[in-house]
């Protein structure tokens, strides 16, 4: 028997520092988690230890702090080749910044082979990207060989910026001639890693012939054999073990995200490369875990120009930018509206002809604007100053809901009106009016939301059995503030990018701001 | 663009070693696979051996194990084959090849004559 | 070890034409084959991989087919600069074996 050891992350999201417990800022040093340092102190721990060990990335190591924005992706490169990593697949966020923004800083910086077996590059981007990401890579492991074919979410032209020249295939359609050709080789251990998600994860373990072991992204499941270390609440035990159509046991794997866990997992192979057992637990990277010193000390280095970035300027605004919990709790404030607008402008996607966008609306708890933005300081917008308005270091998400979960939404937004909570929605290609004078639970009398499939974006009732795209706070995608039906009845949910970074890409781009209270949220006569 | 620069040609005495060199350029060395593969004048090719640039990890051809041995310098991307106890058999064209998996050579380099000759 | 056989040393064609270079390995290779051009005093560069995969920036000229042990480099309307020494390859077992050539020349 053979003995290899995955050490793998998943959906990293720009936390080369150590954060929090709930992967925010860290505050209180002795309490924080993960990074980068700690990381690696684990790995070399881990690799003086066991013999055969594989460090792998299933994707989505882009967007999620002030470390992408300032650095777009050589950070990723640069502490990846660090930490040595074997192997990564690419994440939908891999492609934010567009092809070039994956094929300068990471593609041709990258030490390690970078993985999907499921895009096709076409036209005149073929050629500039050929080599510079493979189906699949074969890796001496001691005295072995490992195959390992990645794959990335078929959804990501909805979810990020690929352009029109990258194909996403079916994952399940595209892998199983790369792990053919695997087999033809005569490598008889094969990893998939990839970024689609655990549903995803576990059709790939039950479907492609010859796959030994899932490492997967995306979805940001946990998964725990025994008592759990922390707040997440496993999905299942790890490894989740799924038999496949021709009858072997797959172990698949998912270490939660932000660089929180180390994933751990231990294979045995026979010499056949069939697996015969297989057993681990993601590995909890808390202040018991030292920084590595080295790594820290490059880290800090790295920092510097973070501190500089935050306090440049990004635009301006000539308008006074409402984010008075008075007016965000109550009613449509400008800030509300500016937020939405930049979420929709960040997820424009024309993707189909039918469409002149694929999403149309966005929702906001008003108690996650936390701050206003004085415009008489010349008008200017920093970093910092956004940072103050949204400072929990959230995402905007996409999700899929129905006309009468956004109902219920919009019901519950108003259900004790009047006593300054956070449940309070802002809106954008939504035109909403209550009527308090009515019982909560029954107070929204209008509800009208902006067409996709049309070519004059136009206003239309919303309708109960519809299905909706909406952008949206992770916070509300998780059930936040009582939203418990989004959470409840959402039919899909993709996590976004960092809400700062959308605001001040937004704002960068429109150079100067002059968001107004336009009606989007009314009261109707005489109950307000 | 994609390079593999060998070093120049070697006259060496039966019984003596060489040293021979292949300096990369235009890709990412440590995720490649270096072969070495000989080919006598009016011959074909014979595949000699591979090293795997991040590991330095090898495989030979059985019929050169002990014959030849495959070293990689990352810092200076540069791939060497020590050919030792040489013979007038030995005397070729030697070519080094930059590969990503198990499979074809993609790029390749020049080549180095060997000559061994008394 | 497994024998490529290139079984025409040398075919003689014209610009122009169409010719078909053959390759029988020893036993099933799973199209686990690629096919190399190689002109007077240069190195070998891939053209086919997996059989039939053209290597990126190769004309489309040619193409490659085939199956268990038989396998075929196609070149349609041959150019003058087509005229070289072609090799299979077969990559499906180690020691990775090349078959002994095909010189292609004009008649």
């Known amino acids: 028997a053979w003995e290899l050891t995955i050490l793998h992350t998943n959906d990293v999201h720009s936390r080369l520092e150590q954060t929090s417990e709930d992967s925010s800022k860290c505050v209180n040093a002795s309490r924080c988690m993960g990074g980068v340092a700690r990381l690696f102190t684990k790995v070399q721990q881990i690799r003086r230890a066991e013999p055969n060990v594989l460090l792998l990335d299933a994707g989505d190591q882009y967007q999620g702090t002030i470390w992408f924005t300032v650095y777009k992706g050589a950070e990723v490169a640069h502490f990846m080749n660090a930490l040595r990593y074997d192997a990564m697949a690419l994440g939908n966020h891999e492609f934010d910044n567009g092809v070039e923004g994956l094929i300068e800083p990471l593609l041709k910086e990258a030490k390690f082979p970078i993985l999907s077996a499921n895009i096709k590059a076409k036209g005149p981007l073929a050629s500039q990207i050929s080599g510079l990401y493979l189906p699949y890579k074969v890796l001496p492991v001691g005295d072995e060989v490992v195959g390992i074919v990645g794959y990335t979410s078929k959804e990501t032209p909805f979810l990020s910026n690929p352009g029109t020249n990258l194909v996403f295939e079916d994952e399940i359609t595209a892998l199983q001639p790369e792990v053919d050709k695997l087999k033809t080789l005569n490598v008889n251990k094969i990893i998939a890693l990839g970024h689609s998600g655990f549903e995803m994860d576990k059709l790939i373990a039950q479907k492609v012939r010859g796959v030994d072991v899932v490492v997967g992204g995306h979805s940001n499941t946990f998964l725990y054999t025994g008592n759990p270390p922390s707040k997440e609440v496993p999905a299942g035990k790890y490894p989740f073990i799924v038999t496949s159509d021709d009858g072997r046991k797959v172990p698949v794997v998912q270490a939660y995200a932000f660089g929180k866990y180390l994933g751990y997992l231990k294979i045995e192979f026979d010499e056949r490369g069939n697996v015969i057992s297989s057993h681990g637990n993601p590995i909890l990277l808390n202040s018991s875990i030292p920084e590595d010193p080295s790594i820290k000390a490059d880290i800090n280095k790295w920092r510097i120009k973070l501190d500089n970035y935050s306090t440049q300027e990004l635009g301006k605004t000539i308008v006074y930018l409402d984010g008075s919990s008075q007016s965000c709790r109550f009613r449509e404030c400008n800030m509300g509206n500016l937020i939405c607008d930049a979420m929709i402008n960040n997820n424009l996607r024309h993707t189909d002809e039918m469409f002149w966008n694929h999403v149309s609306m966005c929702i906001l708890n008003g108690g996650g604007i936390r701050s206003p933005i004085d415009e008489r300081n010349n008008g200017t917008i920093t970093w910092e100053n956004l940072a103050a308005v949204l400072p929990f270091g959230g995402t905007f998400d996409l999700v899929q809901l129905k006309g009468s979960t956004l109902k219920k939404a919009f019901e519950h937004s108003v259900h004790r009106y009047g006593q300054s909570t956070g449940e309070f929605l802002q809106v954008g290609g939504i035109h909403v009016v209550y009527d308090l004078s009515r019982k909560p639970g029954d107070r929204v009398v209008k509800l009208d939301v902006l067409c996709t499939k049309c070519r004059v974006p136009s206003y239309d009732p919303l309708k109960m059995d519809e299905v909706y795209k909406v952008i949206l706070p992770n916070f509300l995608a998780n059930g936040g503030d009582g939203f418990q039906m989004i959470k409840d009845e959402l039919l899909r949910h993709d996590s976004g990018d960092q809400d700062i970074n959308v605001v001040s890409t937004y704002i960068s781009k429109m150079k100067v701001i002059y968001p107004a209270v336009e009606g989007r949220i009314k009261f109707s006569t005489g109950s307000h | 663009q994609i390079q593999l620069q060998q070093s120049g040609a070697e006259l060496v005495k039966p019984g003596a070693s060489v040293n021979l060199s292949c300096k990369t350029s235009g890709f990412t060395f440590s995720s490649s696979y270096i072969s070495w593969l000989k080919q006598k004048p009016g011959q074909s090719l014979e595949w000699i051996a591979w090293?795997?640039?991040?590991?330095?990890?090898?495989r030979y051809n059985q019929k050169f194990t002990g014959k030849a041995q495959l070293t990689v310098d990352t810092s200076s991307r540069t791939a060497y084959m020590q050919f030792s106890s040489l013979t007038t058999e030995d005397s070729a064209i030697y070519y080094c090849?930059?590969?990503?998996?198990?499979?074809?050579?993609?790029?390749w380099g020049q080549g180095t004559t060997l000559t061994v000759s008394s | 070890d497994i024998v490529m056989t290139q079984s025409h040393k040398f075919m003689a064609t014209s610009v122009g034409d169409r010719v078909n270079i053959t390759c029988k390995a020893s036993q099933d290779v799973s199209t686990a084959v690629a096919w190399y051009q190689q002109k007077p005093g240069q190195s070998p560069k891939l053209l086919l991989y997996w059989a039939s995969t053209r290597q990126t920036g190769v004309p489309d000229h040619f193409t490659g087919s085939g199956s268990g042990t038989d396998y075929t480099l196609t070149i349609n309307s041959v150019q003058a600069d087509d005229l070289a020494l072609y090799y299979c390859?077969?990559?499906?077992?180690?020691?990775?074996?090349f078959g002994g050539g095909t010189k292609l020349e004009i008649k």
């Open positions: 090293i795997y640039a991040g590991t330095g990890t090898t």
């Open positions: 090849a930059r590969h990503v998996n198990w499979d074809h050579f993609e790029y």
């Open positions: 390859q077969q990559y499906y077992r180690t020691p990775w074996t």
